[in-house]
Interface confidence: low
């Protein structure tokens, strides 16, 4: 027969969970032993695993509520395709019966004593009620039993006395105007109202009670705007750390306008929110080294040769510079301390020369003295030999530029009776006076 097939069996409740579908055979459903099945909806759920006894059910209620009875519990053989221990088929119930006793004895009714005397009337004036009582002790009930009927009865009574009129309050009067126009000031604003003990007034004869409580009440006014609060400075904060690691710096203290914070249009604190101080690390700041200007080039020489002057023989020369001013662990100068180049020496070499064009006019000299003049020159300029501009000194190191070095002895045709320099001078015109600009401002 077809069954409903489920994907889970819940051991604790014995219920099928996760409906897969119906219309399948038990054999097909139970191809997966984790599955479970029901023969009809709401029927007994059987797991597909091999049969074993379920947990025992809880004990059923005791068969009687008092004295000794008995109670049952059961377990079921659940599973498929096999038997539980004792060769029992799936679906079979096994029962256990035990004695039980919810309450040792059963209740027994009791009997009433006679009625007691009437109590005084419940009021001291006009009409009221009075009560009398009886006891359930003739005999007393047993094992939680009781007596039938009521333990007390009441009837009307009349004191033959006129009652006094007690005072009662009339309705409250209106609230008085508020005692202030804003809240949060030195005095909390209040409004007041009063009432009369006249609804009714207490009687004189017999005397009635006065009205309880107060004839007036006060409350805080609501809906008022808050009073303005002027701001006040909080304390100065800690001094900030000195922001520098050397030399002088500036530290700062801050305070906040929060003692109290200005509120509701009250004025802000007067004065400054910060103040500064000089801080001294007492540590000199590092000074980085700086290169001096390059020194003069050394004479152009070639190792193992006495002189290479006036010859097409490249040599080498160097110049140096000094890293000065470095103090207090400042950076050293970057770059090379020594500069080396290749050179041809033309020191004191007699070379053919040619006259240069006129130089530009020089500065007026003396600048602040009498009759300053300016000058320009034409120079006897040497014509340098046509030696190769680059050489390869060491194989595999490529070509190196070669520079002419030295002061040659140029020879030119005489010009205006001169062999090396021709100079022309002119006076400078409309010369202003030299004045200290600082003194001019005064």
């Amino acid at each position: 027969d077809p069954v409903l097939c489920f994907t889970q069996y819940e051991e604790s409740s014995g219920k099928c969970k996760g409906l897969l579908g119906g219309g399948v055979s038990v054999e097909d459903c139970c191809l997966n032993t984790a599955f479970a099945y029901q023969k009809r909806s709401g029927g007994l759920c059987q797991p597909c695993r091999s049969p074993r006894w379920s947990l025992w059910s809880t004990w059923a209620p005791c068969s009687v509520t008092c004295s000794e009875g008995s109670q049952l519990r059961y377990r079921r053989c659940v599973g498929w395709n096999g038997q539980c221990s004792g060769k029992v088929a799936p679906g079979t119930l096994e029962w256990q019966l035990q004695a039980c006793e919810d309450q040792q004895c059963c209740p027994e009714m009791g009997g009433w004593s006679g009625w007691g005397p009437w109590e005084p009337c419940s009021v001291t004036c006009s009409k009221g009620t009075r009560t009398r009582r009886r006891a359930c002790n003739h005999p007393a009930p047993k094992c939680g039993g009781h007596c039938p009927g009521q333990a007390q009865e009441s009837e009307a009574c009349d004191t033959q006395q006129v009652c006094p009129t007690h005072g009662a309050w009339a309705t409250w009067g209106p609230w008085t105007p508020c005692s202030a126009s804003c809240h949060g000031g030195p005095h909390e604003p209040k409004e007041t109202r009063s009432r009369k003990c006249s609804a009714p007034e207490p009687s004189q004869k017999p005397p009635g009670k006065p009205c309880p409580g107060l004839a007036y009440e006060q409350r805080r006014c609501t809906g008022l705007p808050p009073c303005p609060v002027a701001g006040g400075w909080g304390p100065w904060g800690p001094v900030s750390p000195c922001p520098v690691t050397c030399g002088l710096g500036q530290t700062m203290e801050q305070r906040t306008c929060n003692h109290p914070v200005p509120q509701h249009g009250g004025p802000f604190c007067a004065g400054d929110a910060t103040r500064t101080h000089i801080c001294n690390t007492a540590v000199p700041c590092p000074v980085d080294g700086e290169w001096d200007s390059w020194g003069e080039w050394s004479p152009c020489i070639r190792r193992n040769m006495k002189s290479i002057s006036c010859q097409e023989i490249p040599g080498q020369q160097s110049r140096g510079r000094t890293c000065r001013g470095r103090k207090f662990d400042g950076h050293r100068c970057a770059g090379q301390q020594q500069d080396i180049r290749h050179c041809y020496s033309i020191q004191h070499c007699p070379l053919k020369g040619s006259w240069s064009e006129w130089s530009t006019w020089g500065l007026c000299m003396p600048p602040c003295g009498p009759n300053p003049t300016r000058a320009r020159q034409r120079l006897c300029t040497p014509l340098l030999p046509k030696y190769p501009p680059t050489v390869s000194m060491v194989e595999g190191q490529g070509e190196k530029n070669v520079t002419f070095w030295g002061r040659p002895l140029p020879r030119c045709e005489e010009l205006q009776g001169q062999k090396l320099v021709v100079e022309e001078k002119r006076p400078c015109l409309h010369v202003p006076a030299c004045k200290d600009p600082e003194e001019e401002e005064l």
Partner: antibody
Framework: KPSQSLSLTCSVT?????????WNWIRQFPGNKLEWMGY???????KYNPSLKNRISITRDTSKNRFFLKLNSVTTEDTATYYC?????????????WGQGTLVTVSA | DIVLTQSPASQSASLGESVTITCLAS??????LAWYQQKPGKSPQLLIY???SLADGVPSRFSGSGSGTKFSFKISSLQAEDFVSYYC?????????FGGGTKLEIK
């Protein structure tokens, strides 16, 4: 022993420690790694390796022409050979002059 | 701190051969680099300063080159006494630091 202080002295001959040299301490760990520890200059200024935090102090005695190393709170990690060395820092800051070294072993 | 990475950590060579050791700086240091030799049980000895200059009394078979971040140290014709350890050191900014060292071993 661990947690104790280590103290070493370097005596200089043939040159006044108040002239332009800088007087250094360098140590060499058992694996041969070299570490510069710090110096005291001819004018008494100190410079220390930040890795030694506040444990190191280099001082001098100009009357006896010697300088000192003190290393506090030592651990077994401070086991090394300790060298003193001199350099002409302003003109040629290379460690041209070295002491012979002292092996210091820290153990419980 | 400036880190100097020296390579190789050890090298085998034969007498009369040439060897080159490299020292790489983690940032540019100009030519502020020195090379030291250390014999077993002895203190280091200055060989090369300013990357290329030979210290007083050092044989000319030792030479240095490079600037910025890459430096080389060369021994052109190995003698028996050269099979020891060599270290580079920067003096560009404190803390002054050393390379890890190179140990020369005889083949």
């Amino acid at each position: 022993k661990p947690s104790q202080s280590l103290s070493l002295t370097c005596s200089v001959t043939g040159y006044s420690i108040t002239s332009t040299y800088y007087w250094n301490w360098i140590r060499q760990f058992p694996g041969n790694k070299l570490e510069w520890m710090g110096y005291i200059s001819y004018d008494g200024t100190n410079k220390y390796n930040p890795s030694l935090k506040n444990r190191i102090s280099i001082t001098r005695d100009t009357s006896k022409n010697r300088f000192f190393l003190k290393l506090n709170s030592v651990t077994t990690e401070d086991t090394a050979t300790y060298y003193c060395a001199g350099d002409d820092y302003d003109r040629s800051p290379w460690f041209a002059y070295w002491g012979q070294g002292t092996l210091v072993t820290v153990s419980a | 701190d400036i880190v100097l990475t020296q390579s190789p950590a050890s090298q085998s060579a034969s007498l009369g051969e040439s060897v080159t050791i490299t020292c790489l700086a983690s940032q540019t240091i100009g030519t502020w680099l020195a090379w030291y030799q250390q014999k077993p049980g002895k203190s280091p000895q200055l060989l090369i300063y300013a990357a290329t200059s030979l210290a007083d009394g050092v044989p000319s078979r030792f030479s240095g080159s490079g600037s910025g971040t890459k430096f080389s140290f060369k021994i052109s014709s190995l003698q028996a006494e050269d099979f020891v350890s060599y270290y580079c050191q920067q003096l560009y900014s404190t803390p002054w630091t050393f390379g890890g060292g190179t140990k020369l071993e005889i083949k």
